[in-house]
């Protein structure tokens, strides 16, 4: 399976809300002993591998923001903790999963990563990730609403396969 990032860049005005999205592509094993762990975190474009380092999003770690379920089931994070920080991550039945960030500030600018771990109990974990940039702008040059820029189909950094 693969993870695709429909948009590689989000440019938003300060104070706006944004939903960053990843999509699970390809065949998904729905076997009894296969489960999925999905989460979000901030990172940097490291020399070794993009999305390797896991930094918190608004002080919430990837452990706090994770989703867990089998296959394409719907799920969302623990509401209380995330919503206190203006965050909510969710996934649907179609392989889409997202994180919504409310009331953006300049400090929210940076690289965001979604991580999917396919857990095959008794065998191994397969991890795939997607990366996208968020730019929060202020002042007269800032857009009135979020502007999104599609990922190029050749951008291997935004689609990784197990």
């Amino acid at each position: 399976f693969k993870v695709a990032t429909p948009y590689s860049l989000y440019v938003c005005p300060e104070g706006q809300n944004v939903t960053l999205t990843c999509r699970l592509l390809g065949p998904v094993d729905k076997g009894h002993d296969v489960t999925f762990y999905k989460t979000w975190y901030r990172s940097s474009r490291g020399e070794v591998q993009t999305c390797s380092e896991r930094r918190p999003i608004r002080n919430l770690t990837f452990q706090d923001l994770h989703l867990h379920h089998g296959g394409h089931q719907a799920a969302n994070t623990s509401h209380d903790l995330a919503q206190r920080h203006g965050l909510e991550s969710a996934s649907d039945h179609h392989g889409n999963f997202s994180i919504t960030m409310r009331n953006l500030t300049l400090l929210d600018s940076g690289l965001y990563c979604c991580l999917v771990v396919e857990i095959r109990h008794h065998h191994s974990e397969h991890r795939v990730h997607g990366a996208m940039e968020l730019q929060v702008q202020t002042g007269k040059d800032a857009p009135s609403n979020c502007v999104v820029y599609p990922s190029s189909s050749q951008d291997s950094e935004n689609i990784t396969a197990a």
């Epitope: 489960t35 591998q49 390797s52 857990i119 065998h123 974990e125």
Partner: antibody, heavy 117, light 107 residues
Framework: QVQLQESGPGLVKPSETLSLTCTVS????????WSWIRQPPGKGLEWIGY???????NYNPSLKSRVTISVDTSKSQFSLKLSSVTAADTAVYYC???????????WGQGTMVIVSS | EIVLTQSPATLSLSPGERATLSCRAS??????LAWYQQKPGQAPRLLIY???NRATGIPARFSGSGSGTDFTLTISSLEPEDFAVYYC?????????FGGGTKVEIK
């Protein structure tokens, strides 16, 4: 802050079953892998197995025939049973939280179990 | 199962010196390797995940490197509290395995 605490008898007779419980406090047990790891005196660490929040288990093949790990989410506890113990099973037993695609990030303080008649 | 071999078994150094610990895997583990520190009577503590990323709260003097089968944990300048046993651990597949450990002792 999630904390783990092992409990159970410190002395078990040969051929009997070792039973330990790990209590998870300060967080939810309904996610992650919940693992048992042991360390014989003066030796290294050995992963025994885990139970996933969904109930799926995975055991070290070297111990699989003797190990059972179970979970009681209502009590925020998971348990280890190791049957037919011998002196070679004498060790400090740790419970730990293992994050998928990450590491053992939280450990109990460990409990010493001696197998002796 | 994947066997992790750590060397040296014991490293005798003085505070302020640089410590270089090695972990070699019997087959490639990509970069799915963690390092732990264990002091006497205590549980292990996570230092490094995914070969080179420091866990939360770990001082910058600890660094990890390597991929595939050869990995290194470096302590740039040993502090008194760094004298302990260090273990590597792979998670590319199960069973999860640990190295035999390297003891860093005061010279």
């Amino acid at each position: 802050q999630v904390q783990l605490q092992e409990s159970g008898p410190g002395l078990v007779k040969p051929s009997e079953t070792l039973s330990l419980t790990c209590t998870v406090s300060g967080g939810s047990i309904s996610s992650y892998y919940w693992s048992w790891i042991r360390q014989p005196p003066g030796k290294g660490l050995e992963w025994i197995g885990y139970i996933y929040h969904s109930g799926s288990t995975n055991y070290n093949p070297s111990l699989k025939s003797r190990v059972t790990i179970s979970v009681d989410t209502s009590k925020s506890q998971f348990s280890l049973k190791l049957s037919s113990v011998t002196a070679a099973d004498t060790a400090v037993y740790y419970c730990a939280r293992d994050i998928p695609a990450f590491a053992f990030d939280i450990w109990g303080q460990g409990t010493m179990v001696i197998v002796s008649s | 199962e994947i066997v992790l071999t750590q060397s040296p078994a014991t490293l005798s150094l003085s505070p302020g010196e640089r410590a270089t610990l090695s972990c070699r895997a019997s087959q490639s583990v990509s970069y799915y390797l963690a390092w732990y520190q264990q002091k006497p009577g205590q549980a292990p503590r996570l230092l490094i995940y995914d070969a080179f990323n420091r866990a939360t709260g770990i001082p910058a003097r600890f660094s990890g490197s390597g991929s595939g089968t050869d990995f290194t944990l470096t302590i740039s300048s040993l502090e008194p509290e760094d004298f302990a046993v260090y273990y590597c651990q792979q998670r590319i597949n199960w069973p999860l395995t640990f190295g035999g450990g390297t003891k860093v002792e005061i010279k």
